[in-house]
């Protein structure tokens, strides 16, 4: 089964800025560019996806401007000449505010949410599938531009069948409490591939680190535990977490720990002694409010193996368990690439881990 | 479980002010925009406002502009509405919704508060 | 703003007909459209998002389609707990990012 991962992100771009789309735009591909529009210098900015880097060529210009009481100018520019604007008299853009802009290409045209609604929509002029670049300029400060890439996979039933390189999907939000979700969350970004998958050698307490290929399913030497890694490039949207183990016969808790400095971002702690997956953050030696809710039976089971599969997002995580989706956790951390450590503890035998 | 809880309506003089309080929990109010929804007395649904807390954002209904201001304290996970210079034509049973987490292209308001009673009357 | 207008106002029905509601946008919403059901003194529930997905939990008879700017809720047999109001809304960023059909009210004959 092929698998295509997601495009890493481009962290803090220095404006203007221009990146190459790898593999080029496709259909239900999506790309957030998450940023502050500046308070100070001028009255525009634009987002381009264009062929190459000159600029001659635009498949779509996406082009806010704070002028004659804001309004946004959507084009196309063909081998250097513009084509008919499409004015949009609304501005959902402040200046000196942060937004979250959200482009989703489809087959007839972008979609383009602002700040949670959809804000327009742009008909191809030219085939989109040309478009191989990003561009940003402007009055802006980008934060980061991600991509999600709309290839799924089957869900499967645990992932202790299957290589990590071929992770099952989210399936969409729960919205109910009895009815199963009905299906394979579209737009799911697959992880990405610079990933570091870590193995241990018969010495124990010896790691070492590997690139990501595929890694052989036969059974692992124990991890030492607690088990303390760091997290290369922190947390960022598209950013997968794997881990698989077993849980003790006799295990009362355990946990799976996301750090930043001498913060606990995301706190996820199975607890067999209360039948909870409990999660919280931890700030300055302080827990906030846990969260406990799930959308079915405890999935952990003492004496059986597990899966565990953390997808960030740019709001929240999103955690499956066994291949199947379990809870979205929020950021009460916001800096993602800080959440630079993983630390696994408790009753639990570690087996595979890949960060 | 997600919950939305209101409160804060009441009885106010014309010219009055009122804050209503969206509670939540279950998730974060920076997570997703939350709306401001109302319902004149044997009337329809009325959209008052939104914020989309993890940018700031926020708009308005013309019927409310410059009168009513939405906020979030997302360390109390709550949203607000503070509802200035009242006026009869807002009485209303006012509504706080939470528009879907479960995708960014999902368009509905999937979970609502119970709703709470403003009256604005001398 | 972009105005919903949603019909019939009322209608009368019996238990096992097809009921089918429709919502105009004066202008292209893209699929940006939900459906709600009220009934008295409670709040609204969802029923179909994004113009024709059903959401969790809810009924198979409720469905939603989209042609254009004109959307269609069908239940496609009435239940004696489906007599409530029904509104549209649409979430497509305008001066109003949204705003809701006048409703319609679905009594039995």
């Known amino acids: 089964m092929a698998f295509s991962g997601s495009q890493a992100p481009y962290l803090s771009p220095a404006v203007p800025f221009s990146g190459t789309i790898q593999g080029g735009l496709q259909d239900g591909l999506q790309i957030t560019v998450n940023g502050t529009v500046l308070s100070s210098s001028g009255t525009r900015f634009a987002v381009n996806f264009q062929t190459g880097f000159s600029g001659n060529d635009i498949a779509f210009h996406f082009n806010p401007r704070f002028e004659d009481g804001g309004y946004v100018v959507c084009n196309t520019r063909q081998n250097g000449s513009w084509g008919p604007e499409e004015r949009k008299t609304h501005m959902p853009f402040q200046k000196g505010m942060p937004f979250d802009l959200c482009f989703l290409v489809q087959s007839s045209d972008f979609k383009v949410m602002v700040n949670g609604i959809l804000f327009v929509q742009y008909f191809h002029r030219v085939p989109f599938h040309r478009v191989d670049t990003i561009s940003v300029n402007g009055s802006v400060q980008l934060s980061y531009i991600s991509f999600q890439n709309p290839r799924t996979v089957p869900v499967q039933p645990a992932f202790s069948t299957v290589p990590f390189s071929q992770p099952v999907c989210f399936p969409p939000r729960p919205r109910g409490r009895r009815q199963k979700p009905p299906g394979v969350w579209p737009a799911n970004p697959a992880p990405i591939t610079q990933t570091v998958i870590h193995t241990v050698q018969s010495a124990p307490g010896q790691m070492f680190s590997t690139p990501a290929i595929p890694p052989m399913m036969y059974p692992h030497p124990a991890y030492p535990m607690p088990f303390i890694t760091t997290i290369l490039g922190g947390l960022y949207p598209s950013k997968s977490i794997l881990l698989s183990g077993t849980v003790l016969p006799s295990a009362q808790r355990f946990h799976i720990n996301l750090c930043s400095g001498n913060h606990i971002a995301f706190h996820l702690n199975p607890r067999f002694d209360e039948n909870a997956v409990v999660r919280n953050t931890q700030i300055d030696n302080s827990w906030g409010s846990e969260e406990r809710s799930l959308p079915r039976k405890m999935p952990f089971v003492r004496g059986q193996s597990f899966s565990v599969w953390i997808l960030c997002e740019a709001h929240c995580l999103k955690v499956a368990v066994d291949g199947q989706h379990l809870f979205e956790y929020y950021h009460r951390l916001r800096n993602l690439p800080t959440i630079n450590r993983l630390e696994v503890g408790g009753d639990i035998q570690l087996t595979h881990v890949q960060t | 479980e997600v919950q939305l809880v209101e409160s804060g309506g009441g009885l106010v003089q014309p010219g009055g002010s009122l804050r209503l309080s969206c509670a939540a929990s279950?998730?974060?109010?920076?997570?997703?925009?939350i709306h401001w929804v109302r319902q004149a007395p044997g009337k329809g649904l009325e959209w008052v406002a939104y914020?989309?807390?993890?940018?700031?954002?926020?708009s308005y209904a013309d019927s409310v502009k410059g009168r009513f201001t939405i906020s979030a304290d997302t360390s109390k996970n709550t949203a607000y509405l503070q509802m200035n210079s009242l006026r009869a034509e807002d009485t209303a049973v006012y509504y706080c919704?939470?528009?879907?987490?479960?995708?960014?292209?999902?368009?509905?308001?999937?979970?609502w508060g119970q709703g709470t009673l403003v009256t604005v009357s001398s | 703003d972009i105005q919903m207008t949603q019909s019939p106002s009322s209608l009368s029905a019996s238990v096992g007909d097809r009921v089918t509601i429709t919502c105009r946008a004066s202008?292209?919403?893209?699929?940006?459209v939900a459906w709600y059901q009220q009934k008295p003194g409670k709040a609204p529930k969802l029923l179909i998002y994004?113009?024709?997905s059903l959401y969790s939990g809810v009924p198979s008879r409720f469905s939603g389609s989209r042609s254009g700017t004109d959307f269609t809720l069908t239940i496609s047999s009435l239940q004696p707990e489906d007599f409530a109001t029904y509104y549209c809304?649409?979430?497509?960023?305008?001066?109003?990012?949204?705003?809701f059909g006048q409703g319609t009210k679905v009594e039995i004959k």
């Open positions: 994004s113009a024709s």
């Open positions: 914020i989309y807390p993890y940018s700031g954002y926020t």
């Open positions: 809304q649409q979430s497509y960023y305008d001066s109003n990012p949204i705003t």
């Open positions: 202008q292209s919403v893209s699929s940006a």
């Open positions: 919704a939470r528009y879907s987490t479960y995708s960014k292209w999902v368009w509905g308001m999937d979970y």
């Open positions: 279950g998730f974060t109010v920076s997570s997703s925009s």
